[in-house]
């Protein structure tokens, strides 16, 4: 039975040209996190495998950095980076948990972080 919940940074905003950290956290389960996939819509950004380490998609290698932790750092942001991002937690023995983050990249210097929220 899947009892865990994914907590994410929720709706966030950042300035064009800047960087942002995408973070998710799995709680309320003793399941082992074996792999975390980071995806933007249907595009794979990066994978963190508990044993094998990190894989960064070739098309994002220049702008994506692994970490901190299981999170992902997006650099040199453009307006085109605005959209939904998903952290997909593969766990053993529970199965798969998914969290959602919405990033808005702003032209102006006004960029405030949104509140955290949970996805069961």
């Amino acid at each position: 039975m899947m009892t865990g919940t994914i907590e994410t940074t929720g709706n966030i905003s950042a300035e064009k040209g800047g960087s942002i950290i995408l973070q998710c956290h799995l709680s309320s389960t003793t399941a082992q996190v074996t792999q975390v996939n980071w995806e933007q819509q249907d595009q794979l950004l990066a994978i963190c495998n508990a044993d094998l380490g990190w894989h960064i998609s070739p098309s994002f290698k220049d702008r994506v950095a692994p970490g901190p932790g299981l999170g992902l750092t997006l650099q040199s942001l453009t307006v085109n980076d605005t959209g939904e991002y998903f952290c997909i937690y593969h766990t053993y023995p529970d199965g798969t948990y998914t969290g959602r983050i919405f990033l808005e990249v702003l032209e102006s210097s006004v960029a405030e972080h949104g509140a955290r929220f949970q996805i069961p």
């Epitope: 995806e39 044993d51 094998l52 380490g53 894989h55 998609s57 593969h90 053993y92 798969t96």
Partner: antibody
């Protein structure tokens, strides 16, 4: 190019423990970033994943076999092994060892990239 | 555990024709799907990973497509050496699971 070779008895008696070894050549387990896996195939049937181990000792087992399975690794001999206890005729199969995730860092996929030739194990008295 | 279902169980095709094999997952596996080919008396061989990327040395006549729960392996023009059993497999969720296989035989 990494190659795998299974070895062990071809005949095991019911209720005994099946023991197989996979020898890895062409690469070092201790420095390899991949899973070492066991998969079996009963005669005329499909493939069944038994379990996988990482060089650090992390193990993952098929829940249907977990109570009877032990997979271990011996980096000094460049080998990994399978032990399956309390066997019955239903455990008769070709047993394959395989490497999984060898290309993960470059290509981001985890699949069974390299397979041994397989060894037939019959459970019979 | 994710259950993989392949159809049809047997596919009869003439050499040179197109073969289309299906694989369905009981829940979404995104694009984390591999296809293997197995000939009699041999170990399986990796054909496709990531649902659509050919493994090293695999001919262009093999192509994979799909994501989520529905996947397809297409062999555009069957050669004599392609008559074999094909398996799909999901990963990374543990436990790894295979489909029951599709046997492609000569019509």
């Amino acid at each position: 190019q990494v190659q795998l070779q299974e070895s062990g008895p071809g005949l095991v008696k019911p209720s005994e423990t099946l023991s197989l070894t996979c020898t890895v050549s062409g690469g070092s387990i201790s420095s390899g970033s991949y899973y070492l896996a066991w998969i079996r195939q009963p005669p005329g049937k499909g493939l069944e994943w038994i379990g996988s181990i990482f060089r650090s000792g992390s193990t993952y087992y098929n829940p249907s076999l977990e109570s009877r399975v032990t997979i271990s690794v011996d980096t000094s001999k460049n080998q990994f092994s399978l032990k399956l206890s309390s066997v019955t005729a239903a455990d008769t199969a070709v047993y394959y060892c395989a490497i999984e995730g060898a290309n993960f860092k470059d290509f981001g996929y985890v699949a069974f990239d390299i397979w041994g030739q397989g060894t037939m194990v019959t459970v019979s008295s | 555990e994710i259950v993989m279902t392949q159809s049809p169980a047997t596919l009869s095709v003439s050499p040179g024709e197109r073969a289309t094999l299906s694989c369905r997952a009981s829940q979404s596996v995104s694009s984390n799907l591999a296809w293997y080919q197995q000939k009699p008396g041999q170990a399986p061989r990796l054909l496709i990973y990531g649902a659509s990327t050919r493994a090293t040395g695999i001919p262009a006549r093999f192509s994979g497509s799909g994501s989520g729960t529905e996947f397809t392996l297409t062999i555009s023009s069957l050669q004599s050496e392609d008559f074999a059993v094909y398996y799909c497999q999901q990963s990374p969720p543990w436990p790894r699971t295979f489909g029951g296989g599709t046997k492609v035989e000569i019509k």
